[in-house]
Every structure is written in structure tokens, then in C-alpha cells.
């Protein structure tokens, strides 16, 4: 849990943060695990410790190994491990998988690519950005603070993006590069605030005492697959499972359907052997997704027996 993988390229700066966090006032000691040798704090060394940070200025392949950091406070010590691997620079353009940071995905509306690990470094704008080793040019690409914005994203924008910046340490400059993949999400689908189709808000449903009754909560959430969407029933503001009335049960699972291309869900509430006290309850149909939550309230009323007299 308290071990972290870090990697870099030879002759570039690499800064690693101790996986164990502490207050800035706590002292942090760093050791090279294989030899248990203490890492110096003097900045004249190529590899030195600076509080929670371990700095390789610049890094060498031989620096690879496991480093131990111990966060010391007056009341406890916490130990973390940094597994550092320094790789030789590739002669060709290909960036191997082991040098890749996490993949990010974007869409027409949201296309930010953050430069990985940049917050650890002392850098100044602007960043340089490359896609598949080609410098990015054109008005569609905007380097903004620590991220790249791509306007009007297209599927062809998918690929490996490298950010390059200069780390400054006591007047000396060191180059840093970091690469991550960018994928483009198909935005044919969309989601919107839930729209409850049934029941109507403040609907009064007629039921017969002693008979069974069903209430259906049905809502639509947008077009295409909806990743976060749910419909559910509540009784007097409480989950059905917490309400503790075995006669009143929610159908297991939600039925998905498509109406006019919209993704919809419905959930049936089954009331067995309707009793007088059920008429006093407030039944809330809730529809929620990543945008928001809507609720429609239903109350039950006794269905009048049919009058057969003329």
C-alpha cells in the first residue's frame, strides 16, 4: 500500500514523492534500500533528499532500485517505499508501455490532457506538447497551465501525447518528459436530468383494501448507454429495505427500455394485501443520474366500492 512505482529517463530530472504523507514540519529520511545507505540532503549531490521529495538531477540508469522514506514525527514513524526505474532513452519514436502514465479519455466537450507528475517540479510555462513525437501546431491545440486543450476533438486525435518541460533547481535546468495515451469517447449518446414519466407528481392512486397494488416508477435519462442511472422507491423518505414492512417490496433489478431512442428505467413497487395504514404513507419515486435527482410523490386513496344501486 505504501509503495509507489516511479520511472524516468536517463539524463532527465526525476522527482519522487514519499508515499507516506506527513506535515511539512516532520522530518523525512531517505535510504537506498539495497544498502540501507542514507541519501544525502546536500543539494550539491546529483541524487539528494529534500523533505518528502527525492530528487535525481539528472537521473542515471544505475539509480534504479527501491528507496525507503521514513516520516518522523514526535509520536510516530511512518515508512514508505519508492520503486524507481530509470530507462535508457529510446532512439526511435515509440514510447514503450512501461514509460506510459495513465490513459485519459476526452470528448468533443472535454479534451484536457494533464501533464503527469508536473506538480512535483519547479517549472515555468509554456509546456511543449508532442503527439506521436510530432510537435503540436495549429490553433486547435492550446497549452494552458499544466494541461493541453484540444478544440473540436475528433477520433484522429487519439494517440500518445508527450509533455516536455524544464525543471529549475538552483539556477540549473533539467529536461523532463512524460507521456500518456489519449482516447476519444464517442459522444453520440448523451445524458440529461432525469425525466420521470410515471407516476405524475402528487398523483393519487386508488387501491382496494385487502387487494394487491403495484406502483411503477419510470424515468428516462438520455440517449445511449447510461453509466450512472437509477430509479427507486422510498417510503416516508426511507429506503424500502430500511422501512421494514415485508408486505411492501421493490422489484429486484431495474428494467431498462428505450423510448424514442432515450434510455429509460422502471422499478415496480409491490404492495401485498393493502392495509388502511398504507394510505397514510408517502411514496416517493426517485430517478437519479450523474446530473441530478428528481422525485415524484404518490399517495394512495381507498377506491370507492362501485355503487350498484340506480
Amino acid at each position: 500500500k505504501f509503495s509507489k512505482q516511479s520511472w524516468g529517463l536517463e539524463n532527465e530530472a526525476l522527482i519522487v514523492r514519499c508515499p507516506r504523507q506527513g506535515k511539512p514540519s516532520y522530518t523525512v529520511d531517505w535510504y537506498y534500500s539495497q544498502t540501507n545507505k542514507s541519501i544525502p540532503t546536500q543539494e550539491r549531490n546529483r541524487v539528494f533528499a529534500s523533505g518528502q521529495l527525492l530528487k535525481f538531477l539528472p537521473a542515471a540508469v544505475a539509480d534504479s532500485g527501491i528507496y525507503t522514506c521514513i516520516v518522523r514525527s514526535p509520536t510516530f514513524n511512518r515508512t514508505g517505499y519508492a520503486n524507481v526505474t530509470i530507462y535508457k532513452k529510446q532512439s526511435d519514436c515509440n514510447v514503450p508501455d512501461y514509460l506510459m502514465y495513465s490513459t485519459v479519455s476526452g470528448s468533443e466537450k472535454n479534451s484536457k490532457i494533464y501533464c503527469p507528475t508536473i506538480d512535483l517540479y519547479n517549472w515555468t510555462a509554456p509546456l511543449e506538447w508532442f503527439k506521436n513525437c510530432q510537435a503540436l501546431q495549429g490553433s486547435r491545440y492550446r497549452a494552458h497551465k499544466s494541461f493541453l486543450v484540444i478544440d473540436n476533438v475528433m477520433t484522429e486525435d487519439a494517440g500518445d501525447y508527450t509533455c516536455k518541460f524544464i525543471h529549475n533547481e538552483n539556477g540549473a535546468n533539467y529536461s523532463v518528459t512524460a507521456t500518456r495515451s489519449f482516447t476519444v469517447k464517442d459522444e453520440q449518446g448523451f445524458s440529461l436530468f432525469p425525466v420521470i414519466g410515471a407516476p405524475a407528481q402528487n398523483e393519487i392512486k386508488e387501491v382496494e383494501i385487502g387487494k394487491n397494488a403495484n406502483l411503477t416508477c419510470s424515468a428516462c435519462f438520455g440517449k445511449g448507454t447510461q453509466f450512472l442511472a437509477a430509479v427507486l422507491w422510498q417510503l416516508n423518505g426511507t429506503k424500502i429495505t430500511d422501512f421494514g414492512e415485508p408486505r411492501i417490496q421493490q422489484e429486484e433489478g431495474q428494467n431498462q427500455s428505450f423510448s424514442n431512442g432515450l434510455a429509460c428505467l422502471d422499478m415496480v413497487l409491490r404492495i401485498a394485501d393493502v392495509k388502511e395504514e398504507d394510505l397514510l404513507l408517502q411514496y416517493d419515486c426517485l430517478a437519479l443520474n450523474l446530473h441530478g435527482l428528481r422525485r415524484h410523490t404518490v399517495r394512495l386513496s381507498r377506491k370507492n366500492p362501485i355503487d350498484h344501486h340506480s
Epitope: 426511507t238 429506503k239 443520474n289 422525485r295
Partner: antibody, heavy 116, light 107 residues
């Protein structure tokens, strides 16, 4: 039945942060959504963002993106709104409200004054 | 963002008057419009949701109408407790936006 109780008034210096809490009672908090709305003195209402605790998803108004953080603690049925890099124009009453987008019931409001 | 324009920004009326406030959206929002009432020093209170549905506990003298871009809040017979500021809010898409408010004052 549903009640939202907010934390007390705050006086803050420019550049600092403020964290306002909103404790909910009278319902199942996990199946709520909480919106945050502010109102500067003598001005109208401005939606800042909202959270759906069941999914852990948050929506922010673009204007506040990067400066506001909305969180929720289901164990205490409390929602929080933290606004950073405060400036004098952030002086306002901050409200939490139940549900999003239809704000059915509201907290009493928390006055945040930003002054040097 | 969807802009909401309310008019008038203020009006003076007497108890018993019929009062109409209008709200216009910068694009169609179907029937996704809410009306709120706010009294000085108090939090807003939801009156009407989905353009025309009366929120539970709200007096029937309040009514809402409209769809698409043009909406109306009507108070059929103004009561002393109705003197307040009224806001419309679109509930169609984020960011949620409010109208600038209409202050209803005693004539």
C-alpha cells in the same frame, strides 16, 4: 420533515478558503442530491454546483470550477462546500438546498464575509 | 449557458390585485422551469415546479404557465404575505440559472 441546518457565519481574509457545512435530517441522505446556491448582498441567486451522494458525482458551474469543492459525508448526513482563493466579491449568503435541479427545501443560509 | 430574463424587475401592487411576472429563456427549456419566493433574510421557497405544478403546501392563488421559452407566474389575488422577491430558474440543463428576480412591493 426535511431539514437542512448550515454552519454559522464566517469572516475570511482575501486569498483564504471557507468550508460551509449543511447537515440534513428527516430522510435518507444517500438518495438526495444537494445543491449549493449563493446570493451576494442585494443580488440574485447563483447556482454553484451540486452533489449526488449515492453516485459520488459532482457538478460545478463553470464559473466556480477549480475554486469550489463539494463533498458529502453519508455517515453524518452532511454536505460541504469549500470555496478557495476568496475575494471580496465572494461575500454572500451561501445556501444548500435539497435536490438538483428542483431545489425543494433550503438551509437557513451561511453568511461569508471576505474582508481584509 | 441558458440565460433567464425576468420582467419586470420590480412592481407595486395592492392587496387583492392580480399580479403577473414573466420569465424568458434564451433557448427552449420545454417545461423545465421553477418559481421561487424569497422574503428578506430568508431562504428561497419553491412555489411552482415543471412550469405549472404547484408545490405541496403552496396556496392555490399561485399558478404557473408556459413552455419552450416564455413562462408566467400569476398571483390571482395578492395577499399581505406575498410581498417578496420572486425568481424563476431553469431546470433543463447545467449550469442551473436563475432570473434576476422580481420584487413585489406594496403600493
Amino acid at each position: 420533515q426535511v431539514q437542512l441546518v448550515q454552519s454559522g457565519a464566517e469572516v475570511k481574509k482575501p486569498g483564504s478558503s471557507v468550508k460551509v457545512s449543511c447537515k440534513a435530517s428527516g430522510g435518507s441522505f444517500s438518495s438526495w442530491a444537494i445543491s449549493w446556491v449563493r446570493q451576494a448582498p442585494g443580488q440574485g441567486l447563483e447556482w454553484m454546483g451540486g452533489i449526488i451522494p449515492l453516485f459520488g458525482t459532482v457538478n460545478y458551474a463553470q464559473k466556480f470550477q477549480g475554486r469550489v469543492t463539494i463533498t458529502a459525508d453519508e455517515s453524518t448526513s452532511t454536505a460541504y462546500m469549500e470555496l478557495s482563493s476568496l475575494r471580496s466579491e465572494d461575500t454572500a449568503v451561501y445556501y444548500c438546498a435539497r435536490d438538483l435541479p428542483d431545489m425543494v427545501s433550503w438551509g437557513q443560509g451561511t453568511l461569508v464575509t471576505v474582508s481584509s | 449557458d441558458i440565460q433567464m430574463t425576468q420582467s419586470p424587475s420590480s412592481l407595486s401592487a395592492s392587496v387583492g390585485d392580480r399580479v403577473t411576472i414573466t420569465c424568458r429563456a434564451s433557448q427552449s427549456i420545454s417545461s423545465y422551469l421553477n418559481w421561487y419566493q424569497q422574503k428578506p433574510g430568508k431562504a428561497p421557497k419553491l412555489l411552482i415546479y415543471a412550469a405549472s405544478s404547484l408545490q405541496s403546501g403552496v396556496p392555490s392563488r399561485f399558478s404557473g404557465s408556459g413552455s419552450g421559452t416564455d413562462f408566467t407566474l400569476t398571483i390571482s389575488s395578492l395577499q399581505p404575505e406575498d410581498f417578496a422577491t420572486y425568481y424563476c430558474q431553469q431546470s433543463y440543463s447545467t449550469p442551473l440559472t436563475f432570473g434576476g428576480g422580481t420584487k413585489v412591493e406594496i403600493k
